[in-house]
């Protein structure tokens, strides 16, 4: 370690000679700046002393409230000004001052870079009293120094509300270069230039940088830190690191992988989550992204039917979440589904194709030729219809749903009846006389309820009327039919 020391004239006679070993020695872990608010003794100080400039770290008391006793000026002894040492070594430094015993209330504190060192574990204050003066030696020790211990250390003594400050002791911890910026992993486009940055500091300075690519040095001559390496382009993955050199030795940065962007791998595990008559919900597991984030995905759907023309429907969707609901499909149909995703380089191949089916749909047409008439007993309404011409995709007919609405004097009531698929007629009880009954019929399959037929109205007279004429579904374009009996 290198040390620098300065010797100057002392403003007050110091404790004479080496400190006598016979003197009582008191140790303290840390004496520090007191807070004396409300308790200041009335000892007064003048900022200057005739014939002597005020230096800022010398306390120059003049008179006391006891009358006329002049107190001598005080200052810390000059000590080593600069300590240079290697990382992980131990260091001990001190400041000392001789305080006449007339100063009966003093405290010492250590400060680093303008902040008081409150931790008590490093500092020891020793007192060597005799009849006239007490020599105070405040020592500060650091075991296994680190870079964070670098800085300017001072002692402060508070004495009768005046502060005396020692000269600074600069601690410089030297060690291997320390990286403040290391190269970062990157994903780059093939044959495209990119930059890597490396920065390291001492002390000691200077710090020189060598770049390493796949274990081989890139630059013959070192560059002063910080260094930027421009790589003109790569065709395959490479690993880069930098070496930082100073007089203490060499530190190697982490190795970073530079990847070449490529098209993604195809998605895997395309799964069916839910099928309805006209939609299929799918999910997939994205493939490797090719070192470039996915932008979007494409769901490709082919109808598996010997009679279809084999055209492919394409649905574009975001890359996340890895799920899509394919809509506008035909009921009870088989489809082959694949997924492809893209990044900035291009599209992946399509995933393995999977087969999926839609379920039965609801009928798309209503029953035909609906007729309604009041039977002879006048207690029932007879309804007749013809089976609708449903497509295969609607699935197997399971029955019919009949809606009949009764309206009389501002009151309306709807009732629903279900009948089996083998029927093409039904009979419903008269609910209200002197009322209009409106009937509609829908075909029902496992896929759901189809559209209702156009309404057919029949008037149910009061008791004693005779006419039994039917009502029927109108020809297309006619208004709602109604038969008044």
């Amino acid at each position: 370690a290198i040390t620098e020391a300065r010797e100057e004239a002392k403003p007050y006679p110091l404790f004479p000679g080496p400190l006598p070993g016979s003197l009582q020695t008191d140790h303290t872990s840390l004496l520090s700046l007191p807070h004396t608010s409300g308790y200041q003794p009335a000892l007064m100080f003048s900022p200057t002393q005739p014939g002597r400039p005020y230096t800022g770290n010398v306390a120059i008391p003049r008179v006391t409230s006891a009358g006329s006793k002049l107190l001598p000026p005080l200052a810390f002894k000059h000590t080593v000004g600069h300590i240079i040492l290697s990382e992980h070594k131990d260091v001990k430094f001190n400041c000392s001052i001789s305080v006449p015993n007339i100063y009966q209330d003093t405290t010492i504190s250590w400060w680093k870079d303008g902040k008081e060192l409150l931790g008590a574990h490093h500092a020891i204050t020793q007192f060597y009293p005799d009849d006239e003066v007490t020599a105070i030696i405040a020592s500060f020790s650091i075991t296994s120094v680190q870079r964070s211990d670098n800085g300017s250390y001072i002692c402060k003594m508070k004495i009768n509300n005046e502060e005396i400050v020692s000269d600074p002791i600069y601690i410089e911890v030297q060690g291997l270069p320390h990286f403040t910026k290391q190269p970062e992993s990157m994903n780059v486009t093939r044959n495209t230039a990119f930059n890597l940055t490396c920065q390291a500091v001492g002390p000691p300075e200077p710090v020189n940088i060598f770049w390493v690519q796949n274990s081989s040095r890139v630059n013959e001559q070192p560059e002063k830190s910080p260094s930027v390496l421009t790589v003109p382009g790569l065709t395959e993955m490479a690993v880069f690191s930098c070496e930082a050199h100073n007089d203490k030795g060499l530190t190697v940065s982490k190795g970073v992988q530079i990847n070449i962007k490529a098209i993604p791998s195809p998605p895997t595990e395309v799964s069916i989550h839910n099928s309805t008559a006209h939609s299929i919900l799918i999910s997939w597991v994205p493939g490797f992204d090719g070192y470039s984030p996915f932008r979007n995905c494409s769901v490709q759907v082919k109808e598996v039917d010997p009679l279809s023309n084999g055209s492919v429907m394409i649905f574009n969707t975001s890359a996340s979440p890895h799920m899509y609901q394919i809509k506008q499909l035909q009921a009870l149909a088989n489809y082959s589904i694949g997924v492809s995703c893209m990044n900035e380089i291009g599209w992946s191949a399509v995933s393995p194709w999977i087969l999926a089916s839609t379920t039965e749909g609801a009928p798309s047409v209503a029953p035909l030729n609906v007729t309604v008439f009041l039977n002879e007993s006048r207690d029932n309404v007879d309804i007749r219809w013809m089976k609708p011409l449903t497509k295969r995709q609607a699935g197997e007919l399971v029955g019919y749903r009949i809606s009949h609405v009764w309206q009389s004097a501002g009151i309306s009531k709807e009732l629903l009846e279900e009948v089996g698929q083998n029927n093409s007629r039904a009979q419903i009880s008269v609910q209200v006389h002197n009322a209009t009954c409106t009937v509609r019929i829908a075909a029902v399959t496992k896929g759901g309820v189809g559209p209702f037929s156009d309404p057919v109205k029949i008037f149910i007279p009061a008791h004693g009327w005779v006419d039994h004429a039917p009502s029927s579904t109108p020809a297309p374009g006619n208004a709602d039919p109604v038969l008044i009996i």
């Epitope: 840390l30 007191p34 308790y39 006391t64 007339i102 009966q104 209330d105 009293p129 009849d131 007490t134």
Partner: antibody
């Protein structure tokens, strides 16, 4: 060796005054400040303040400002505590205690104590 | 003002035991804590200064430790003459303040 010898017990009436002395020997009197500590019967210790034996400058704790006065006679190495307008609650043992070395505020030597009893 | 909270307020132990008394400061007092022993009718006696330093003539069975706000006085191998009341004192900040005391009694 260092010794602090205090004056004897006092019995006083409320409203009276008392002066307790603390005579130092075995060291340079003006090199160490003198503290005063009170201990009421069956109670703990209470710091009253201190006096700079070189300058004569006293420092009082808040509870002891007013009726309590610290003084010195350096020619006979003696510190004094005077209490005026005594009250029953002033009944206590009063100790003088020497400040340790410069730059520290603990006490290293104590007087034997003076019992002041205030009773009508 | 800095409060010094001493615990326990009383303690029973036997000769040969090891006992620990604690003082907690209401704010950081660095190592500016002293410990005193007082026997009935007598003046306090110095034991420890600056948290961990034994005064001259104090037996080695007395030890102090701590810094900041937590301080302990430990007496190992208790002797008959150690049964007394013990006080801590913070001398970091004016006004100086004592703990409430710990009375150590024979079990």
């Amino acid at each position: 060796q260092v010794q602090l010898v205090q004056s004897g017990s006092e019995l006083k009436k409320p409203g009276a005054s008392v002066k307790v002395s603390c005579k130092a020997s075995g060291y340079t009197f003006t090199n160490h400040g003198m503290n005063w500590v009170r201990q009421a019967p069956g109670q703990g210790l209470e710091w009253m303040g201190w006096i700079n034996t070189y300058t004569g400058e006293p420092t009082y704790a808040d509870d002891f400002k007013g009726r309590f006065v610290f003084s010195l006679d350096t020619s006979v190495s003696t510190a004094y505590l005077q209490i005026s307008s005594l009250k029953a609650e002033d009944t206590a043992v009063y100790y003088c205690a020497r400040k340790g070395v410069t730059a520290a505020r603990y006490f290293d030597y104590w007087g034997q104590g003076t019992l002041v009893t205030v009773s009508s | 003002d800095i409060q010094m909270t001493q615990s326990p307020s009383s303690l029973s132990a036997s000769v040969g035991d090891r006992v620990t008394i604690t003082c907690r400061a209401s704010q950081n007092v660095r190592t500016a804590v002293a410990w005193y022993q007082q026997k009935p009718g007598k003046a306090p006696k110095r034991l420890i200064y600056l948290a961990s330093n034994r005064h001259t003539g104090v037996p080695s069975r007395f030890s102090g430790s701590g810094s900041g706000t937590e301080f302990t006085l430990t007496i190992s191998n208790l002797q008959p003459e150690d049964f007394a009341t013990y006080y801590c004192l913070q001398h970091w900040n004016y006004p100086l303040t004592f703990g409430g005391g710990t009375k150590l009694e024979i079990k």
